[in-house]
Interface confidence: low
């Protein structure tokens, strides 16, 4: 008996053929010896099945002996043994029908499960094998899980269904719901702008829901809200702002956020986070301000930055042009005495400056300049 | 199962390119990432980097960054890796190699091309 | 990069007998998301491509023999074949493939006493 297999929604042409390649009579019939479609000369004639009005054939191919069964938007109840009896002869083709849909919704957030439901014909018992866009493998069998789902499993997952050494294929497309990146560091001198820019790293027509910006100050003891706003269709308003520090945000996305001015008690971590309408959970992204500044105070020149640095970042005091007079693994510097000149405060990762700021040293008799 | 075939020995003189191919088959090749691993003579042995076939991102190793470049073709079911301004320490055979079983644990790998780097 | 250190360089085993290589990785390579061990062994013969043995820290690949098994968690890993036999003579890497790039350890040479 030869096996067919197809997918839920499909067509399916199974095929039946005859010794005389001449147009001669034929049947197409069920298990229950239901008569699907047939011909009388060259007229298409229908039995009383429930394919009635999704049956075809190709008239055609009638002519050179061919006589197939087109069965369309293909059902998981279709799945049967149909029958095509030409010249007293029986073929049987048995037909199993496969669906394989993902759960409540393909656009999923970062984090959470995407659960593949197979659906497939009583008595059957497919293998399944999904590989995602970055190339892992998972198998299962009526259902499968991939948890903590990530930014790269965004794209079109594969999935073949295994039955009787015969397979069909399912392309899914899946689209994960996160931020572009899962955080960021921004690194400022104390009195700049600072740009904090939160880019999607997905597009839909409408986008909607509400989002907030909380901020643990390194200085402070606990977080506050820096800003709360809503999204519709991809506008932003702004629904309420702390007085201190005062944030402006883009109207547009990607959401964008300035601070006009970084100062030492704004150096911290936030999390902005959005909550998209009809979705349970969040997107999360976390940015990070690390401020620096240098001054002089009487005899002591000093370099300090806050913010959350990482341990390997190195600190240094140099006089431009010379080697670092100072240079440690911590997050304040100074040099006594520093002779005049332009020094400059370096916070640097494996020899990558993140971070400059240049402070003028006058002769002793005189006040420092900052440029 | 993929297969994965790669293309003969080559001789080349430092600083020259050299570029090495790897044809898959018997798979669905958009389904697979080929990364590229390389051993010298007696040596251990070196991952340089990846090629998606499903979309042709690419993922370098550092080290070789800037002088390798990798490529896919997917009319052939072929992937390309490039290595430029050649020197003695890259005599090695060069793998492709992919996964089937769990990402980047290599379950099919190429034959090995043998690139020799000489004066 | 995962520096991953293999001990010993070499081994002499008699046949029959047990042989023992350990990996060790410079940080973890145990997942949170899957609860798996990102690691994997391979036996690699002269003039040959490596062979994949074990992937997930513990898991045969299809068609290699039940002699070869893998085990540890986190940082510490181990490939044990319970009884060597003439054609295990190879050189055998670990390899952690949690972190990219992956990295690969210096090999271990097998060979009978």
């Known amino acids: 008996k030869k096996v067919v297999l197809g997918k839920k929604g499909d067509t399916v042409e199974l095929t039946c053929t005859a010794s005389q390649k001449k147009s001669i009579q034929f049947h197409w019939k069920n298990s229950n010896q239901i008569k699907i479609l047939g011909n009388q000369g060259s007229f298409l004639t229908k039995g009383p099945s429930k394919l009635n009005d999704r049956a075809d054939s190709r008239r055609s191919l009638w002519d050179q002996g061919n006589f197939p069964l087109i069965i369309k938007n293909l059902k998981i109840e279709d799945s049967d043994t149909y029958i095509c009896e030409v010249e007293d002869q029986k073929e049987e083709v048995q037909l199993l029908v496969f669906g394989l849909t993902a759960n409540s919704d393909t656009h999923l957030l970062q984090g959470q499960s995407l659960t593949l439901t197979l659906e497939s014909p009583p008595g059957s018992s497919p293998s399944v094998q999904c590989r995602s866009p970055r190339g892992k493998n998972i198998q299962g069998g009526k259902t499968l899980s991939v948890s903590q789902l990530e930014l790269q499993d965004s794209g079109t997952w594969t999935c073949t269904v295994l039955q009787n050494q015969k397979k069909v294929e399912f392309k899914i497309d899946i689209v994960v719901l996160a931020f572009q990146k899962a955080s960021s560091i921004v690194y400022k001198k104390e009195g700049e702008q600072v740009e904090f820019s939160f880019p999607l790293a997905f597009t839909v027509e409408k986008l909607t829901g509400s989002g907030e910006l909380w901020w643990q100050a390194e200085r402070a003891s606990s977080s506050k809200s820096w800003i709360t706003f809503d999204l519709k269709n991809k506008e932003v308003s702004v629904k309420r702002v702390t007085q201190d520090p005062k944030l402006q945000m883009g109207k547009k996305l990607p959401l964008h956020l300035t601070l006009p001015q970084a100062l030492p008690q704004y150096a911290g971590s936030g999390n902005l986070t959005l909550a998209l309408e009809a979705k349970t959970g969040k997107l999360h992204q976390e940015v990070n301000l690390v401020v620096m500044r240098a001054t002089q105070l009487q005899k002591n020149l000093t370099c300090e930055v806050w913010g959350p640095t990482s341990p390997k970042l190195m600190l240094s005091l140099k006089l431009e042009n010379k080697e670092a007079k100072v240079s440690k693994r911590e997050k304040a510097v100074w040099v006594l005495n520093p002779e005049a000149g332009m020094w400059q405060c370096l916070l640097s990762d494996s020899g990558q400056v993140l971070l400059e700021s240049n402070i003028k040293v006058l002769p002793t008799w005189s006040t420092p300049v900052q440029p | 199962q993929v297969q994965l075939v790669q293309s003969g020995a080559e001789v080349k003189k430092p600083g020259a390119s050299v570029k090495v191919s790897c044809k898959a088959s018997?798979?669905?090749?958009?389904?697979?990432?080929i990364s590229w691993v390389r051993q010298a003579p007696g040596q251990g042995l070196e991952w340089m980097g990846w090629?998606?076939?499903?979309?042709?991102?690419?993922n370098y190793a550092q080290k070789f960054q800037g002088r390798v470049t990798m490529t896919r073709d997917t009319s052939t079911s072929t992937v390309y890796m490039e290595l430029s301004s050649l020197r003695s320490e890259d005599t090695a055979v060069y793998y492709c190699?992919?996964?089937?079983?769990?990402?980047?644990?290599?379950?099919?790998w190429g034959q090995g091309t043998t690139v020799t780097v000489s004066s | 990069d995962i520096v991953m250190t293999q001990s010993p360089d070499s081994l002499a085993v008699s046949l029959g007998e047990r042989a023992t290589i350990n990996c060790k990785s410079s940080?973890?390579?145990?997942?949170?998301?899957?609860?798996?061990?990102?690691l994997a062994w391979y036996q690699q013969k002269p003039g040959q491509p490596p062979k994949l043995l074990i992937y997930?820290?513990?898991t045969r690949e299809s068609g290699v023999p039940d002699r070869f098994s893998g085990s540890g968690s986190g940082t510490d890993f181990t490939l044990t074949i319970s009884s060597l036999q003439a054609e295990d003579v190879a050189v055998y890497y670990c390899?952690?493939?949690?972190?990219?790039?992956?990295?690969f350890g210096q090999g271990t040479k097998v060979e009978i006493k």
């Open positions: 090629i998606s076939g499903y979309n042709g991102n690419t």
């Open positions: 018997g798979g669905t090749f958009s389904s697979y990432a």
């Open positions: 190699a992919s996964s089937d079983v769990s990402p980047d644990a290599f379950d099919i």
């Open positions: 390899q952690q493939y949690y972190s990219a790039p992956p990295t």
């Open positions: 940080q973890s390579v145990l997942s949170s998301s899957y609860n798996k061990n990102f």
């Open positions: 997930w820290a513990s």
